[in-house]
Structure formats: structure tokens, C-alpha cells
């Protein structure tokens, strides 16, 4: 662990009530093929515990969709990864929106720090998937 | 190699016959950018031979495609990446519908353990492109 | 730095004139959560500096879209990501169309040389959005 | 204790308005979302839409445009069911109700508040 | 909008008996499935969350269980004080809908 490898996937625990668009997080060999291997659930949320260079990576699915039922709702669709916390960190890293799609995925390299919560922000009146082969959101430290 | 960095990137080969929905990979220089260093291929499947956790990714894309030809089937085209062999192991580990789109690209990490197979699941009744820059499937160890 | 984790992530400067389909990138700690360790930006363009295998990923986001307007134009707009200098080494390395979408985001491994350029060929008449978190860029060494 | 609390059972003539309470106590008004569900007499639940305590944005269900509107007074915890221009199909049992962690899973419910529209 | 169909409006069992309530929607719902009381006062309680999980305070006599379309509630051992009408709801998208009840009462 020394070397600073640390790691970790997660999977869908639940999603936040209407005014509050995070998703809350689960992981543990017990859940499936979700760990955490340094990095620390607070809550939910994912909270960095080494400062370093991460790759950010996930993929959410929306239940019960299709093409038609992303494109008729008035609000898009959208999920945004960022800091939440602290404060004075806090920044948007990843945002895409859903459009005529029912998945999103993608990946980022960025710079953390001890101390960041990640939230997983979900706007819009659709639910995610809770299927772990298709809604997931992990980070790998990948250098100082 | 002792370090365990294994990795591969593979390009498609071909798709199996109607009842197989596996896609068919190969990788090695002479073939292009593709290359396996430590995982082999078992009959077009990916093998993993070092326990460890892995990035897994991929992106297919659909040949002679549009968003109507993805939409107007009545059987969504889906990609399935899982462990498919040995039978106790096996388990979906990523999943994606096309939906209106024509392209499909995801990663995440996930523990393999030596004698994994992967198989990658195209149902539906589109075929993918084989172009090297819009087909492929890689695997990167990245931790025990 | 002696070990080899060259890393970039780059965000997007500006777009070309009209018969330049590259986009233009620039990073750094100033800008916000882009930094260059390694590579090197050759007027907006990606230079890698050390021979190795590298994961090679993108996002890139549409300004002003929505899913009729990427698909009701006669050419889709494609995003390619290939090695364009030196010339001898030009190859298409990653490609994805837009169709209904806003947003494409995909990755991959791929060898690089010292002295491969990158370049990301936008074409289409849509512009891409340079919000730092919807349209990045950014390759990081894996293995020799 | 986190409770509910609605005004008591109204009668009202056809083309009248009404306005309906439910009062929170127990917990910050303004971190949860309220929502109102009507039951006619002898039938099931219908969800009517949902308030934003934090900005004061209504959503209707398709069923409730027009006559429905949800208000608040936050400094007095309380939400507000308002129907104008009663009609008979109006009659009903109005609940209040507000999840906990899970979306749309309602863990606290008001009592419940009996209108009668009769002429 | 999604239909909660629950075909079966009244039922009649013995304290004591097992009890099974189901539910089924117009389309998959990934589970996002919830279970209501409603006392003969009118007075509504949230029984279980996401097809399965007990809501707290419910007494472990109630279970859930279902996938895809179709989803129930039992009762393991009927008591005098679950004599109530029980709804079922999707919560996986708007607008939230509920079945029409099934009413539970004592032979």
C-alpha cells in the first residue's frame, strides 16, 4: 500500500431524495466486484485519502429508458462529477448530459487531494440503474 | 515482465455465427497497434494470466449505421463485456445498449484472476466495424 | 520523473480556421485542472516525449446541441484522435461520430514514440464547448 | 420527532377555492421535498407532484395543471395544497408526504385532509 | 406513465395464515418498488423500499421480494393489527404511480 496504488469501484448503493442529485456508493468484495483500497466512503460518497494525479472513470445507466424517454423530459438528463468538499475545493471535473442516449461513460485525469469527497451529481426526474454491470464509478491513483 | 504490467489491446477479428454472439479478437504488431503483452488469446478470447486488478476497456463501433438503423430494431443491439470461463467465475462485468447511437465506449476496473476468460457479447443483429480506431478491447493490470 | 509516468491533460484553447479540423489544446496549473508532466504542447498540439505504451483518452462536448442538431446535418460530425507528425508515422488511432449524441468520450491503449504528435480532427460545423469539464484531453504512460 | 401535520376536513361549494396545510416539524423544512397525494373516496393513491422547499419550484403531474398550485411559507415550515375553481371530482383526501434518503420513497406522511365538495 | 396493476382488490386470510399481495407494473422497473399501509383511519406507513428493504420499525413478519414486472408483498404470519389496504408504488420515474390497493381483510 506504501506505493500509493490506491484504488477503488463502486457501485450503486441508492439515490439521494428529490432536492439532493447525489448518488450514494457502496463497495466491498461482499457487494460484488467493488472495492476500496485506500480511498474511504463518507456517507455515500467517495473521499480521497492521497494526494496525487487520479484517473476519474464511470458509467451510469438510466432504468427503465429509451431514446424517446431521455429526449421528452423538459431538464436533460445530466450527470457531473466534482469535488463537493471542502468548499473551498469545490469544482466540477466531468459533466455530460444524457441526451437521446441511456448511458453515459467516461474518464478523466485530474489532480486530488487528501481530504476530497467526490460527488456524483444526477439532475433530471429519471433513476439509475442499480445493475452493477452497468452503473459504476471508481478512481485509481496513477502518479504523485 | 516481472513487474506484472500486463496489458493488451486488441482489434476485432471477426463476429462469431448466428448463435455465438462473442466478437472475435486479435492483437500483435504486424496486425497494426495492437499487442498483447502478458494476456493471450484462446480462440479469439482474451485470457488473463496474472491475478491482479485490471482496467478494462472497449468501444465498438456499429457498421453501416445511423441513429434509425439503432432505433428501429426491436431488439435493442447490446454489448456485453463479462468473464465468461471458467463457468464459476462467470459474471457480466460491463454493459452498454447502443439505443440511437452507433458507437459504444466504456471502461472500468475490475479484479481477474489468472485463467479469466473475457468474452465480449454483441447481440442484436448489426455488426460492428472492424476499423482498428473504431473497434477495439484492451485490458491494463494496474494493481495486485 | 525518472520513471516514466509522462501525463498531460490538456483542456480545449480554441478550434482552427476553417480548412483545419484540429483543435487546439493548452494546459497548466494557471489554467485550472490541466497540467503537462512530460509531454509537451507544439502549438496546441500534443508531443509525446518518452517511447512507452500510453492510454489515450477524450472527451468532447458540442456547443449549442441538442440531439436534432447533430442529427439533422448531411455530414455527422466525427471526432478522430491520430498521430499526424512525423508523417511517416500518421495513423488514425481512435475515431467516433457524434450521431444523436452531444457528447463523445471513449479511450484507449496505443504505442507512442518520442516525437509522435497528436492531433483530435473535429469535423463538422459544430463547435466543441471549452468548459473545462466537458471537453478534455489527455494520454498517460502505462508501460515501456 | 419528524411529523406532518394538515389542516382539518373542508367543505366547500363547487367554483370556491381551498387551501390546504401541512406543517413540518422535526427536521430543516427546507432539505426535503414535499409532496401531495389526492385519494377519492373508495380509490387508490394519485401522485400530484412535488414542491422544492429549497426554491420554491412546483412540478405537477399531468392530471394537476391549471386549478392545482403548491406554495410555501418557510419561515412557518409549512407547504400549501391550493385548488381554485372546485369541481366535483375534487373531493377527496389530500395527503402530505416526504422521503427520508431514497428518492421518491415517502417515509412521513401527514394525516391526511378530507375535502367535500357539494353545492 | 407507468400502470401499478394490483389485480386482486380484497382478500380475505386467518390471523396466523401467510399472506401474499402482488403487484405488477405496465413495464420493467428495476426494482425502484415501494410498499404502503393504509390503517382503516386512513393513516399511511411506508412498509418496504426498493422491492425488498424493510422499512424501519416495519416488523419482520412483512418481506418483499420480485424483479422486472412483477413484485409482492407478504405477510409471514397475519396479525389482527395488519388488517389495512396496501398499495404498491414505482418510484423509478415520473410521474410516481400507485396501484389501485388490495384490502386485506380477516376471515
Known amino acids: 500500500e506504501s506505493l500509493g496504488w490506491d484504488i477503488a469501484e463502486l457501485q450503486l448503493n441508492h439515490t439521494g431524495p428529490q432536492q439532493d442529485p447525489r448518488l450514494y456508493w457502496q463497495g466491498g468484495p461482499a457487494l460484488g466486484r467493488s472495492f476500496l483500497r485506500g480511498p474511504e466512503l463518507d456517507k455515500g460518497q467517495l473521499r480521497i485519502r492521497r494526494d496525487g494525479i487520479y484517473m476519474v472513470h464511470i458509467q451510469v445507466t438510466l432504468a427503465i429508458c429509451s431514446s424517446t424517454s431521455t429526449s421528452r423530459h423538459h431538464h436533460p438528463t445530466t450527470l457531473a462529477v466534482g469535488i463537493c468538499s471542502p468548499a473551498s475545493r469545490s469544482i466540477s471535473l466531468l459533466r455530460l448530459s444524457f441526451h437521446q442516449g441511456c448511458t453515459i461513460a467516461s474518464q478523466r485525469l485530474t489532480p486530488l487531494a487528501r481530504g476530497d469527497t467526490l460527488c456524483t451529481n444526477l439532475t433530471g426526474t429519471l433513476l439509475p440503474s442499480r445493475n452493477t454491470d452497468e452503473t459504476f464509478f471508481g478512481v485509481q491513483w496513477v502518479r504523485p | 515482465e516481472s513487474l506484472g504490467w500486463d496489458i493488451a489491446e486488441l482489434q476485432l477479428n471477426h463476429t462469431g455465427p448466428q448463435q455465438d454472439p462473442r466478437l472475435y479478437w486479435q492483437g500483435g504488431p504486424a496486425l497494426g497497434r495492437s499487442f498483447l503483452r502478458g494476456p493471450e488469446l484462446d480462440k479469439g478470447q482474451l485470457r488473463i494470466r496474472r491475478d491482479g486488478i485490471y482496467m478494462v476497456h472497449i468501444q465498438v463501433t456499429l457498421a453501416i449505421c445511423s441513429s434509425t438503423s439503432t432505433s428501429r430494431h426491436h431488439h435493442p443491439t447490446t454489448l456485453a463485456v463479462g468473464i465468461c470461463s471458467p463457468a464459476s467465475r462467470s459474471i457480466s462485468l460491463l454493459r452498454l445498449s447502443f439505443h440511437q447511437g452507433c458507437t459504444i465506449a466504456s471502461q472500468r476496473l475490475t479484479p481477474l484472476a489468472r485463467g479469466d476468460t473475457l468474452c465480449t457479447n454483441l447481440t442484436g443483429t448489426l455488426l460492428p466495424s472492424r476499423n482498428t480506431d473504431e473497434t477495439f478491447f484492451g485490458v491494463q493490470w494496474v494493481r495486485p | 520523473e525518472s520513471l516514466g509516468w509522462d501525463i498531460a491533460e490538456l483542456q480545449l484553447n480554441h478550434t482552427g480556421p476553417q480548412q483545419d479540423p484540429r483543435l487546439y489544446w493548452q494546459g497548466g496549473p494557471a489554467l485550472g485542472r490541466s497540467f503537462l508532466r512530460g509531454p509537451e504542447l507544439d502549438k496546441g498540439q500534443l508531443r509525446i516525449r518518452r517511447d512507452g505504451i500510453y492510454m489515450v483518452h477524450i472527451q468532447v462536448t458540442l456547443a449549442i446541441c441538442s440531439s436534432t442538431s447533430t442529427s439533422r446535418h448531411h455530414h455527422p460530425t466525427t471526432l478522430a484522435v491520430g498521430i499526424c507528425s512525423p508523417a511517416s508515422r500518421s495513423i488514425s488511432l481512435l475515431r467516433l461520430s457524434f450521431h444523436q449524441g452531444c457528447t463523445i468520450a471513449s479511450q484507449r491503449l496505443t504505442p507512442l514514440a518520442r516525437g509522435d504528435t497528436l492531433c483530435t480532427n473535429l469535423t463538422g460545423t459544430l463547435l466543441p464547448s471549452r468548459n473545462t469539464d466537458e471537453t478534455f484531453f489527455g494520454v498517460q504512460w502505462v508501460r515501456p | 420527532e419528524i411529523q406532518l401535520v394538515q389542516s382539518g376536513p373542508e367543505l366547500k361549494k363547487p367554483g370556491e377555492t381551498v387551501k390546504i396545510s401541512c406543517k413540518a416539524s422535526g427536521y430543516t423544512f427546507t432539505n426535503y421535498g414535499m409532496n401531495w397525494v389526492k385519494q377519492a373516496p373508495g380509490q387508490g393513491l394519485k401522485w400530484m407532484g412535488w414542491i422544492n422547499t429549497y426554491t420554491g419550484e412546483p412540478t405537477y403531474a399531468d392530471d394537476f395543471t391549471g386549478r392545482f398550485a403548491f406554495s410555501l411559507e418557510t419561515s412557518a415550515s409549512t407547504a400549501y395544497l391550493q385548488i381554485n375553481n372546485l369541481k366535483n371530482e375534487d373531493m377527496a383526501a389530500y395527503f402530505c408526504?416526504?422521503?427520508?434518503?431514497?428518492?421518491?420513497?415517502?417515509?412521513?406522511w401527514g394525516q391526511g385532509t378530507t375535502l367535500t365538495v357539494s353545492s | 406513465d407507468i400502470q401499478m396493476i394490483q389485480s386482486t382488490s380484497s382478500l380475505s386470510a386467518s390471523l396466523g395464515n401467510r399472506v401474499t399481495i402482488s403487484c405488477r407494473a405496465s413495464q420493467d422497473i428495476s426494482n425502484y418498488l415501494n410498499w404502503y399501509q393504509q390503517k382503516p383511519d386512513g393513516t399511511v406507513k411506508l412498509l418496504i423500499y426498493?422491492?425488498?428493504r424493510l422499512h424501519a420499525g416495519v416488523p419482520s413478519r412483512f418481506s418483499g421480494s420480485g424483479s422486472g414486472t412483477d413484485y409482492s408483498l407478504t405477510i409471514s404470519n397475519l396479525e389482527q393489527e395488519d388488517i389495512a389496504t396496501y398499495f404498491c408504488q414505482q418510484g423509478v420515474t415520473l410521474p410516481l404511480t400507485f396501484g389501485a390497493g388490495t384490502k386485506l381483510e380477516i376471515k
Open positions: 426498493d422491492t425488498s
Open positions: 408526504a416526504r422521503e427520508e434518503d431514497y428518492r421518491y420513497v415517502f417515509n412521513y
